[in-house]
């Protein structure tokens, strides 16, 4: 439902991929129970929410992760929604940490951040973690997403 | 505050309920510092949240819980967010998962779920548990709501 | 972006501050990305969020923190989320809570609260913890704000 | 289109059990969940249970939780609901129905249906 041409409704939700790539920057599709308002909001490379529109946002992710005290690096599992804006340096908006689980094989913990932000024309979201290998993708387990106020 | 006769401002907040029940649907009230915005969101049998409009909604919960490692299943805690509508499947809309603590009697987590849908006239959310009887009730642990966007 | 002059857009999100203060009550400031739409929000005191306006609010605040079981009470950590209204009794909206950890020197937890109230002019909103010098200040890791409706 | 063929109805006696079957085939065979819909006479079309392809998450209805088990065997294109301690009020006709991939939360897609097959309970 729109609130009107000139101020369409814009909110996304994606769902978790698992990925091969080594990248700390966790994958996304547009599949199962998806949300995807119209192009003024658009998934790229499967990887960050794009927008078109000048405005407030409220932006969240949830990631849940199975992750071992013994198996893991000493420093604890952490979770960020970063922003890149055209012509700005990166920054991370939002960050979660959880010390990895004593249980074997592994202990599953969620996380969920969530925000109010001002995002320019142009301006990509995107979430970090700081290991993939460990992310939980089974459903509903793991989404991004966003909605202008 | 309404947006107009055509657009009502839609949004509920509700209370968790202990209950005698052996359901692992969490049970809720209309208590408290509750919200209920009007008859276009309504809470049916003390368990789901129905909406009567179509439209994108942002529906959350949180749920608190007290367990312990040796009392419990080997299973994670998992809560669930789930979605029922007419003539479809019911289906999972978001889930998360916290292992047990080893603290004794039991460790207390809190769990937040929350998410961007699509809801059809109709439609009601509920939240499904593991085991209802290690979820906190006291003032504030556990609610469930949605605001339509 | 203004919804019109009569509705404006209300927004705040604000950064978790480091504090000498002994209170219970966590500090907040404007700075890095923080969001201030108008000044029918407002941070008093470094320490609420107060708004001038009647209405539906989707409140939310994130903490981060870290403990260790065996330096820490026996209690768990506990973050909450608290109503002021002129003339009316400090109320807990939300709270969540997580057992310390086993991990040394501490381990990393994060927590996030979140829904939707209905607020009064002049009523404020403020986050509460059981223990401020376990709050984690790094960028991203603890915030608080709410948007209305 | 995907085409669903139900098998296992039958006549049994309350307390009883029974095994219904769905094999889904059809060209480029893309199905996100495949579950189980009853009628009995004179009713709507309820819900029974789901099973979810990508990783085999299950839900069913209230009415059902503890008697009846949904599978899958993905090799076969093939959904299973097992039904124990059966009830009169479980007497119906059980529809198969499929949910094809890429279906958003804001695209409604049509399910794929079986043509049904009857469950009576009765002594």
């Known amino acids: 439902m729109q609130k009107g041409d000139q101020n369409p409704q814009i909110a996304a939700h994606v769902i978790s991929e698992a990925s091969s790539k080594t990248t700390s920057v966790l994958q996304w599709a547009e599949k199962g129970y998806y949300t995807m308002s119209n192009n003024l909001v658009t998934l790229e490379n499967g990887k960050q929410l794009t927008v078109k529109r000048q405005g407030l946002y409220y932006i969240y992710a949830q990631v849940t992760f199975c992750s071992n005290r013994e198996a893991s690096s000493q420093a604890p599992f952490i979770a960020s929604l970063c922003l890149k804006s055209p012509g700005r340096f990166e920054r991370i908006l939002l960050r979660a940490a959880n010390t990895h689980s004593s249980a074997k094989p592994c202990g599953q913990q969620s996380i969920h951040l969530g925000g109010v932000f001002e995002l320019q024309p142009g301006a990509s979201v995107f979430v970090n973690v700081t290991d993939p290998s460990q992310v939980s993708h089974g459903t509903g387990f793991t989404s991004f997403g966003l909605l202008k106020l | 505050m309404q947006k107009g006769d055509q657009n009502p401002q839609i949004a509920a907040h509700v209370i968790s309920e202990a209950s005698s029940k052996t359901t692992s649907v969490l049970q809720w009230a209309e208590k408290g510092y509750y919200t209920m915005s009007n008859n276009l969101v309504t809470l049916e049998n003390g368990k789901q949240l129905t909406v009567k409009r179509q439209g994108l909604y942002y529906i959350y919960a949180q749920v608190t819980f007290c367990s312990n490692r040796e009392a419990s299943s080997q299973a994670p805690f998992i809560a669930s967010l789930c979605l029922k509508s007419p003539g479809r499947f019911e289906r999972i809309l978001l889930r998360a998962a916290n292992t047990h603590s080893s603290a004794k009697p039991c460790g207390q987590q809190s769990i937040h779920l929350g998410g961007v849908f699509e809801l059809q006239p109709g439609a009601s959310v509920f939240v499904n548990v593991t085991d209802p009887s290690q979820v906190s009730h006291g003032t504030g642990f556990t609610s469930f709501g949605l605001l339509k966007l | 972006m203004q919804k019109g002059d009569q509705n404006p857009q209300i927004a705040a999100h604000v950064i978790s501050e480091a504090s000498s203060k002994t209170t219970s009550v966590l500090q907040w400031a404007e700075k890095g990305y923080y969001t201030m739409s108008n000044n029918l929000v407002t941070l008093e005191n470094g320490k609420q969020l107060t708004v001038k306006r009647q209405g539906l609010y989707y409140i939310y605040a994130q903490v981060t923190f870290c403990s260790n079981r065996e330096a820490s009470s026996q209690a768990p950590f506990i973050a909450s989320l608290c109503l002021k209204s002129p003339g009316r009794f400090e109320r807990i909206l939300l709270r969540a809570a997580n057992t310390h950890s086993s991990a040394k020197p501490c381990g990393q937890q994060s927590i996030h609260l979140g829904g939707v109230f209905e607020l009064q002019p002049g009523a404020s909103v403020f986050v509460n913890v059981t223990d401020p010098s376990q709050v984690s200040h790094g960028t991203g890791f603890t915030s608080f704000g709410l948007l209305k409706l | 289109e995907v085409q669903l063929v139900e098998s296992g109805g039958g006549l049994v006696q309350p307390g009883g059990s029974l095994r219904l079957s769905c094999a889904a085939s059809g060209s480029g065979l893309s199905i996100n969940a495949m579950g189980w819909f009853r009628q009995a006479p004179g009713k709507e079309r309820e819900f029974v249970a789901v099973i979810y392809s990508s990783d085999g998450s299950t839900l069913y209805a209230d009415s059902v939780k503890g008697r009846f088990t949904i599978s899958a065997d993905n090799s076969k294109n093939t959904a299973y609901l097992q039904m124990n301690s059966l009830k009169p009020e479980d007497t119906a006709v059980y529809y198969c129905?499929?949910?094809?991939?890429?279906?958003?939360?804001?695209?409604?897609?049509?399910?794929?249906w079986g043509q049904g097959t009857l469950v009576t309970v009765s002594s």
């Open positions: 129905a499929a949910e094809p991939y890429g279906s958003g939360s804001s695209l409604i897609s049509e399910y794929d």
